[in-house]
Interface confidence: low
Amino acid sequence: MIPTFTALLCLGLSLGPRTHMQAGPLPKPTLWAEPGSVISWGNSVTIWCQGTLEAREYRLDKEESPAPWDRQNPLEPKNKARFSIPSMTEDYAGRYRCYYRSPVGWSQPSDPLELVMTGAYSKPTLSALPSPLVTSGKSVTLLCQSRSPMDTFLLIKERAAHPLLHLRSEHGAQQHQAEFPMSPVTSVHGGTYRCFSSHGFSHYLLSHPSDPLELIVSGSLEDPRPSPTRSVSTAAGPEDQPLMPTGSVPHSGLRRHWEVLIGVLVVSILLLSLLLFLLLQHWRQGKHRTLAQRQADFQRPPGAAEPEPKDGGLQRRSSPAADVQGENFCAAVKNTQPEDGVEMDTRQSPHDEDPQAVTYAKVKHSRPRREMASPPSPLSGEFLDTKDRQAEEDRQMDTEAAASEAPQDVTYAQLHSFTLRQKATEPPPSQEGASPAEPSVYATLAIH
């Protein structure tokens, strides 16, 4: 099983000592959730614990709850047990571990499983600046906005094995938006994105997902053909559609990477052949145009979009008459306003895809820390109940960025001016599917 959201919310809260049973020499079981570990409120979920054929009993523990949380007899052929949650609520959100008992004794605990509930908060808005249609090689910033103050923002990409980024700010500095810059953009960045927001005191409880945003990457000089994004639907489907893959083929990303490279190579050879042919024609016909002029014809491929101005171009006056100076004119304009206040301002749709906020925080670099990935676990971190617990809010919160297996593939920019930013480079090929045995690397940015 591939890691889906592995350690998406790796908060690093050290829990106090807990009473655990004596761990024996038995190998640890595997713990996972179906249909996934990110579940909308009210939906059913099944937690599976798989041990060995010698297992006599399975036990599931939930952190912050009295142990054992549940016990189950093994299902034939005795190597696994099922723990059912018929309807997801806040009470079920949290971190779980399981054990099995054999004639020899109790096993080691499984890697933790983080069960996350969505729908706890109002949905954020995801938008792209300057536009969701971006030329390869240019920059784009994805903005996740919330009008309720939140301190955690998560950006995910459909069909990606790992989250792209998780930003978290210090307590007392809840903000409304996180920026996710991507530069330079390549065809790999194309696809459908969603974001979530959450509060520091309940990180196992996420907002409703934002409406999906499709990032479309068009061609560039290196790739003259319009580069299609993956075939994903932009329609906002049911909230419970899996936000993570459930069975991607390992190394499929690597295969696609090679396909892209081969494609680029073929196109380059074709262009080179065309150039040689034209040069030959030029030499034979004795044209007067210079080689430099001819090469200039190739500088901008057809369909390559001009970069859009950041502010959307020059702002035009709404009325030429506005240039007219004078008290009487303005007074006349004032009197034209409706007095009853019944007219609605309908410039925005209920989904409000417009950029309206910026998240600010000071961020310092800290050394990336390595953690073992728990294959079925989508989110890693300590979540608390929905009650406002001052003690928990007073703890230091980290900004976590879930990166790839290779730390060099994701760069973390020093934040400028108080703007909470994350610079994301091209996602590595391994992002689409990774071996559960391999550790994941997370870059931690501490906010102070």
């Epitope: 109002s122 009008r147 307590h171 903000q175 301002d345 929905t386």
Partner: antibody, heavy 111, light 112 residues
């Protein structure tokens, strides 16, 4: 769109419940606030509710205890006001997190 | 509780001119400040969130700046349609969620 209702003329000391009703949107995913404006005066924030499952509520200090914001259905948020005085006379606006405001409902407290 | 002090209470300027409105918070609210524009008989219109980010459709003539306790809204190249009352609003709360969403007293902008 959103529309407020429930306003009207009441006598001091009475209670009143205002309703914010949504059309074409589900309140279950939005942040809803109540704001009021006395005649010829400025805007005054009363309370907000995150209508997700958390139902987090935030109140202005002066409104705590006397005003209660709640979500009564997927398309309705109410503001219960008790022990009303002449100082509560105002137009009451409902605002959503997608920047949709209702036209407001006028509440007049007079004996 | 957080207080927002808005200055000036009213200002008069000519078409094509510039107006600067200040908003001071009694304690740091980081960048959690919004600006609204309201005309008589209408609900407020959202202009800027998080101190400096413009809402969709808001002309670039409207610029928000500041962080912490000092914030500014600057309207340049004034037009007659800019005549309105402008409000700042805190959109931040601390660990005890006590700051809330207070409004400033408002600034009436008159265009002559």
């Amino acid at each position: 769109s959103v529309k407020e209702s429930g306003g009207g003329l009441v006598t001091p000391g009475e209670s009143l419940k205002l309703t914010c009703k949504a059309s074409g949107m589900d309140f279950s995913k939005y942040w809803i606030c109540w704001v009021r404006q006395a005649p010829g005066k400025g805007l005054e924030w009363i309370a907000c509710i995150d209508t997700g499952r958390s139902a987090i509520t935030v109140y202005a200090k002066w409104a705590k205890g006397r005003f209660t914001i709640s979500k009564t259905s997927s398309t309705t948020v109410t503001l219960q006001m008790t022990t009303l005085t002449a100082a509560d006379t105002a137009t009451y606006f409902c605002e959503t997190s997608v920047d949709l405001w209702g036209p407001g409902t006028l509440v007049t407290i007079s004996s | 509780e957080l207080d927002l002090t808005q200055t000036p209470a009213s200002v008069e300027a000519a078409v094509g001119g510039t107006v600067t409105i200040k908003c001071q918070a009694s304690e740091s609210i980081y960048s959690g400040l919004a600006w609204y524009k309201q005309k008589p008989g209408q609900p407020p219109k959202f202009l800027i969130l998080s101190a400096s980010t413009q809402a969709s459709g808001v002309p670039s003539r409207f610029k928000g700046s500041g962080s912490g306790t000092e914030f500014t809204l600057t309207i340049s190249d004034l037009e007659c349609a800019d005549a309105a009352t402008y409000y700042c609003q805190s959109r931040h709360y601390g660990s005890s969620r006590s700051y809330g969403f207070a409004f400033g007293g408002g600034t009436e902008v008159e265009i002559k």
